[in-house]
């Protein structure tokens, strides 16, 4: 806390300017006043200022906006913002994307700090939903942001918005995330052709449930076999092996080598052996010929 | 961390000069600022010299037109070059770097000094 002092002659600022950064915290306290500062907030930025001196300048800002700062001052804080706390943040409302922007601007080449994610949760609170240009500025800034929300969250997001997300975006979304976002994705993208539409929902696959995996092993897709061993378990185990061979088309080779992890391990378990050395990949652990295979789940339902 | 380490000073007469150097090793991505500081004995530390990274300098008024600052980016170095030294000059000079660093609780903002080197001027 910088004590209260007078302002030495001659040395009460008129304007915020370089010749400020001469001036010992003290003097800032005593000869800036606040209303200019909050006048040419935007010149603070380009003035070197030590972050002693940032630290007088959010207390002056502080005491003459104790309910929260305006958006014509938070859209300048440039470095100033990294001194704030979810606290101060917290008081704003800020409704601009160009303010969004500029602040995350300050926060670039760093992980999401508590400062930034408050930031981000009172402006997409204000705005009511996750619209398709704050989706866009958000994973410029944060790829990973989309798979930070809870599927609550997602639920907001509107199919339009879907066009924003490309595929390293969902990189570290959760089988809970992709099925909140995937029926999204279908809808977003339902007028497009065959080939269009699997490059453009490919990413959001790992959401699809079963049918939709044998309608896609209809149209000749070549799904390669990172996203099938991101597909859900429970929608690939009812597929027949032809259903995963038109599924994968060439990229069917690279079962053998995945044979031991989830889902292809589950899906092997559940086919007969006959059919799987229809593949001629030596994939072994299908249901030996002559057994009978009861679906349980089937019994109790009719019962 | 950022280590900054200053050379150069010296004893001179009136009149000559001196070039100070300043070389930051560690951490030295995000420097922003880089800044030289003198005190003076029985003195407050004042600001000289600011440079920023793009190479914007201000002075401090009793310096200007005899004081230079520079910086080398790719040496991660700054530089004060004094001319026409006088009496008053006399203080130890301190470099000072500021940069944005990572932490877990997300940027914050940080503040590096040398040890400093000494300038004498003679009359």
């Known amino acids: 806390e910088v004590e209260k002092t007078a302002c030495p002659s001659g040395k009460k600022a008129r304007e915020i300017d370089e010749s400020l950064i001469f001036y010992k915290k003290w003097e800032l306290e005593a000869c800036v006043d606040a209303a200019l500062l909050a006048t040419q907030m935007d010149r603070v930025n380009a003035i070197p200022f030590t972050y002693e001196q940032l630290d007088v300048l959010k207390h002056k800002l502080d005491e003459l906006y104790p309910q929260g700062y305006p958006e014509s001052v938070i859209q300048h804080l440039g470095y100033l913002f990294l001194k704030m706390s979810p606290e101060d943040i917290r008081k704003w409302n800020v409704t601009s994307l160009e303010t969004l922007k500029a602040l995350l601007e300050v926060n670039k080449g760093h992980e999401m700090s508590p400062q930034v994610a408050t930031l981000i949760d009172r402006f997409v609170k204000g705005r009511g939903q996750l619209d398709k240009d704050t989706l866009d500025t958000l994973t410029a800034f944060y790829p990973g942001y989309l798979c930070s929300l809870s599927p609550e969250e997602l639920s907001s997001v509107p199919p339009s918005s879907i066009w924003a997300v490309r595929p390293q975006d969902l990189d570290t979304c959760d089988p809970r995330q992709l099925d909140v976002l995937y029926p999204k994705a279908r809808l977003a993208f339902q007028n497009m052709n065959g080939s269009e539409y699997f490059v453009k929902i490919q990413s959001f696959l790992g959401g699809a449930p079963t049918e939709d995996l044998k309608a896609l092993s209809q149209q000749n897709v070549s799904m390669d076999l990172a996203t099938f061993m991101k597909l859900r378990t429970d929608a690939v185990l009812p597929l027949t092996v032809a259903e995963v061979q038109k599924l994968l088309g060439p990229h069917v080779e690279g079962l053998k080598a995945e044979e031991r992890h989830r889902p292809v391990r589950d899906w092997i378990l559940r086919q007969r052996q006959d059919d799987l050395d229809t593949l001629g990949l030596g994939l072994q652990g299908g249901i030996p010929n002559g057994y009978l295979v009861l679906d349980l789940s089937m019994q109790e339902a009719l019962s | 961390q950022v280590q900054l380490v200053e050379s150069g000073g010296g004893l001179v007469q009136a009149g000559g000069s001196l070039r100070l150097s300043c070389v930051a090793s560690?951490?030295?991505?995000?420097?922003?600022?880089m800044r030289w500081y003198r005190q003076a004995p029985g003195k407050e530390r004042e600001l000289v010299a600011v440079?920023?990274?793009?190479?914007?300098?201000i002075y401090l008024d009793a310096v200007k037109g005899r004081f230079t600052i520079s910086r080398d980016n790719a040496n991660n170095a700054i530089y004060l070059e004094m001319n026409s030294l006088k009496p008053e000059d006399t203080a130890v000079y301190v470099c000072?770097?500021?940069?944005?660093?990572?932490?877990?609780?997300?940027?914050?903002?940080?503040?590096?000094f040398g040890q400093g080197t000494q300038v004498t001027v003679s009359s």
């Open positions: 560690g951490s030295t991505s995000n420097i922003n600022n």
């Open positions: 440079i920023t990274r793009g190479g914007y300098a």
């Open positions: 000072n770097a500021d940069r944005v660093e990572g932490t877990s609780g997300g940027p914050q903002l940080r503040d590096y």
